[in-house]
Interface confidence: medium
């Protein structure tokens, strides 16, 4: 439309571009003056005024124009007098903008540049918190990091103060993010106070003081997994070889592993002496790809290494014929995970396995036949159930073996029976059954002097960190039609919160981007112990029937009328994705009351014996509990 304006906008933009290339907008030759009120750097969201005053020889401007980032502004411009105009912005939210103004002079067909200025908006710094200093073995540096708080958008500098508690001498280090301080410069003994001051054009804040002892903040040289091998014994055994160059004598390490398709990590702990390569044994399922990571800390000290890089190992297919059949039930159970129990060292008592396996084979054949008959004859299906109960071992339909009649299992079974009386509902969902129990041993010894939850550049552990109990039970709850999503539950006494973590995990320093584990997560977040993720709210499978779990609340101390009512009323729930770009483990959201009931805390621990996965029976005998009664 506007040929002249287009032409001269281009000329002015090019002129300014070349001017900036030679020293920025502040160095352009001005034929007047441009200024900003309240200031060139101001708090984001403020109303601001930009003034332009022309001082061009032989020119009384016809019009004054304002440009923001090269685009002409057309609104909120007021002519104050013959040579001055004002541009007003309400609620300015851009972190940076380049402003310039021009004049239309009668003797210049084109607009004449008056002047330009870079403006910035942002926030004053937050109080830096979670100040952490560590010494990576062999680095020769003390690395200090902190949580800077919300993004300021403007240039923010940090001054790290390091004060010796022995000599009272204080050193200051200026930085923009983190700081590496040479340990050679720390001549004032072993004890120091460290604090951080943050400052920018809009304000200044200071952190609390952190007291450190140089001997307590050393993180051992990185532990590395070098190789893995699987030995084909009666029970295949995988050996992971790993090592560290550390010279620290007492080192505690953790190795975590999981199937790549799984969400939950299993963790093994070791007190290690790195005078030789470490070998760790695992009894893993065949033909599955596993991932391993290891990390260490000086025993009894505060900080952990970051987890080592991911080490992948696929277990071979070659396993004894009989054993492999135990894993062929997936086709029967809508993809539900085969149950297994793993403990710290995964030792296994195989006595009775043969009988159990024979029973399983016989049962599998029967089940196949019954299923086929059941498809064609519904009346036969209901009639035969009572007879089958007489044939199969009681443990197949009552309890997880050696679980001493677990309340959780019983309650879920009873509830599944009640829920399924309405046969029209059966197609909509699968009753939840516990299909996997894992024990994870959390270190008993944890320092207690550092209570602050560590975020920022420090990695958040993705399993519970409080060692309030010697073990923590990991329970699987189904995401109905999509198989099982692993859950982590940490059963805390009343008043305990995960924010009071007793140990802190340090991350490999990759400032300023924070990451979780293998770097998938650009933001550090605490996820609830239970969280239900729905991949698409449009699919039928994503309707959640909380009624299935309401029965759990009817158990004395675990129940409250309000909670029960709310569960019964709210039969569906939609869940928001925190951010589409993040890869967060999918988890099922349960109220705390559910969690505390699910916790098998004081009961006898399940035995390690292999047992038949109950979920196979579930779809065929959903009224087993009722018939038994």
């Amino acid at each position: 439309m506007n040929q002249v304006t287009i032409q001269w906008d281009a000329v002015i933009a090019l002129y300014i571009l070349f001017s900036w290339c030679h020293g920025g907008i502040t160095n352009i030759n001005c034929s007047g003056h441009i200024w900003v009120e309240p200031a060139t750097i101001f708090k984001m969201g403020m109303n601001i005024s930009i003034y332009c005053q022309a001082a061009i020889k032989n020119c009384q401007p016809r019009k004054l124009h304002f440009y923001k980032n090269g685009i002409k502004e057309r609104f909120q411009i007021t002519r104050i007098n013959k040579t001055t105009a004002r541009l007003w912005y309400k609620n300015f939210l851009e972190p940076h903008a380049s402003m310039y103004c021009t004049a239309e002079c009668p003797k210049h067909f084109q607009e004449t540049l008056i002047c330009g200025k870079d403006i910035s908006s942002g926030y004053p710094p937050d109080i830096p918190d979670e100040v952490t200093c560590v010494i990576y073995e062999y680095s020769g540096n003390m690395t200090c990091t902190w949580n800077a708080g919300k993004l300021t958008y403007i240039d923010t500098k940090y001054v790290v103060h390091v004060k010796s508690l022995e000599t009272e001498e204080e050193q200051q280090y200026l930085t923009s993010s983190y700081i590496n301080i040479s340990t050679d410069s720390l001549q004032g003994g072993k004890k120091y106070l460290v604090w951080v001051q943050a400052a920018n054009a809009l304000g200044m804040e200071e952190s609390k003081q952190l007291q450190i002892h140089l001997d307590d903040i050393v993180i051992p040289s990185a532990a590395v997994i070098s190789r893995a091998e699987t030995i084909n014994a009666t029970v295949p055994k995988t050996i992971i070889y790993w090592d560290s160059q550390t010279t620290i004598e007492k080192v505690s390490c953790e190795m975590r592993y999981k199937a790549t398709t799984n969400q939950t990590w299993n963790v093994k702990e070791f007190d290690t002496n790195f005078t030789y390569v470490q070998q760790s044994e695992f009894y893993l399922e065949p033909n599955i790809k596993y991932v391993f990571q290891v990390r260490c800390q000086e025993t009894g000290k505060r900080y952990w290494q970051p987890w080592s890089s991911l080490f992948f190992h696929k277990t071979p297919e070659t396993v004894p014929q009989v054993t492999s059949k135990a894993f062929q039930h997936d086709t029967w159970n809508s993809g539900l995970t085969v149950a297994s129990i793993s403990t710290g060292h995964l030792t296994s008592d195989n006595r009775g396995d043969i009988g159990l396996l024979l029973g399983m084979i016989v049962f599998a054949v029967m089940l196949s036949i019954l299923s086929l008959i059941g498809i064609f004859n519904r009346s036969f299906r209901t009639g035969i159930k009572r007879r089958i109960l007489l044939l199969i071992p009681k443990w197949l339909y009552e309890d997880i073996p050696n679980m001493k009649n677990s309340n959780v299992v019983k309650m879920l079974q009873e509830n599944s029976e009640l829920m399924n009386n309405n046969s029209s509902e059966q197609v909509l969902y699968v009753d939840p059954m516990i299909t996997e129990i894992k024990e994870i041993f959390i270190p008993e010894h944890k320092p207690t002097d550092y209570k602050k939850e560590n975020t920022g550049p420090l990695e958040t552990r993705d399993y519970p960190q409080n060692s309030l109990f010697d073990n923590t039970t990991v329970v699987y709850i189904p995401d109905l039609n999509t198989g099982y999503k692993p859950q982590i539950s940490n059963f805390l006494p009343e008043g305990s919160h995960l924010s009071n973590n007793n140990e802190i995990t340090s991350l490999t320093l990759k400032p300023p981007v924070d990451s979780l584990d293998s770097g998938n997560n650009p933001r550090l977040q605490k996820h609830p112990n239970f969280a239900f993720s729905v991949s698409s709210v449009n699919s039928l499978s994503n309707t959640i029937f909380l009624g299935e779990l309401s029965l759990i609340l009817n158990q004395g101390e675990c129940s409250s009328p309000d909670i029960q009512n709310s569960v019964e009323e709210e039969t569906t729930m939609l869940l928001e994705n925190d951010s589409p770009s993040e890869t967060i483990p999918e988890q099922t959201l349960l109220p705390d009351e559910f969690v505390s009931c699910l916790g098998i805390v004081n009961e006898e621990l399940p035995s390690i014996n292999t047992y038949f996965p109950q979920n196979i029976l579930e779809s065929h005998f959903n009224r087993i509990s009722l018939l038994e009664k």
Partner: antibody
Framework: EFQLQQFGPELLKPGASVKISCKAS????????MHWVKQSHGKSLEWIGG????????GYNGKFKDKATLTVDKSSSTAYMELRSLTSEDSAVYYC???????????WGQGTTLTVSS | DIKMTQSPSSMYASLGERVTITCKAS??????LSWCQQKPGKSPKALIY???SLVDGVPSRFSGSGSGQDYSLTISSLEYEDMGIYYC?????????FGGGTKLEMK
């Protein structure tokens, strides 16, 4: 006395080109922008474009961008408008006009009548 | 482009009569409007600039008013030499645009 002197009329064939002149006198030629305006027979006025003699800056109405080219000769204080690929639609009176410091066309040339006919 | 709508397109008036011609812009033109007069066979001549300022040498019976989008030219007492065509011109934005003209004739 201020004066903008135009010459003509012109009679041309379709497809030809023509360069219309406008000679300024009585003022400093480089101090004022020179504009060109078209008036078809019995019609209103249309702004074609303008040129700054001192700075060489030009601006065109998009409608005439491919039709007209504006130039100046400072030594003779003359502004020129070249019209190319003439058609009967280009038959009109063409005026040059000075845009003064108070931002209006204070002086106009007497106009050049252009007739395009085969 | 900014469109200038002028009205009426023609009118008849008597000597000594008060005459008003109006011009409406398609958008706010910030009073960057001038009025000019053209007599048959002659070049246009400026009367008013910046909506209400009288050009030197123009009789005081001519006056301009208006702001934003609406402007008017008034001849307080029509005289014989005022016959001709009147045009409004906006010069707020390129391309400059003229109104369609108002032909003023004697009754």
């Amino acid at each position: 006395e201020f004066q903008l002197q135009q010459f003509g009329p012109e009679l041309l064939k379709p497809g030809a080109s023509v360069k219309i002149s406008c000679k300024a006198s009585g003022y400093t030629f480089t101090d004022y922008i020179m504009h060109w305006v078209k008036q078809s027979h019995g019609k209103s006025l249309e702004w074609i474009g303008g040129i700054s003699p001192n700075y060489g800056g030009t601006g065109y109405n998009g409608k005439f961008k491919d039709k007209a080219t504006l130039t100046v000769d400072k030594s003779s204080s003359t502004a020129y408008m070249e019209l190319r690929s003439l058609t009967s639609e280009d038959s009109a009176v063409y005026y040059c006009a000075r845009f003064n410091n108070y931002y209006y066309f204070d002086y106009w040339g007497q106009g050049t009548t252009l007739t395009v006919s085969s | 482009d900014i469109k200038m709508t002028q009205s009426p397109s023609s009118m008849y008036a008597s000597l000594g009569e008060r005459v008003t011609i109006t011009c409406k812009a398609s958008q706010d033109i910030n009073s960057y409007l001038s009025w000019c007069q053209q007599k048959p066979g002659k070049s246009p001549k400026a009367l008013i600039y910046r909506a209400n300022s009288l050009v030197d040498g123009v009789p005081s019976r001519f006056s301009g008013s208006g702001s934003g989008q609406d402007y008017s030219l008034t001849i307080s007492s029509l005289e014989y030499e005022d016959m001709g065509i009147y045009y409004c011109l906006q010069y707020d934005e390129f391309p400059y645009t003229f109104g369609g003209g108002t032909k003023l004739e004697m009754k």
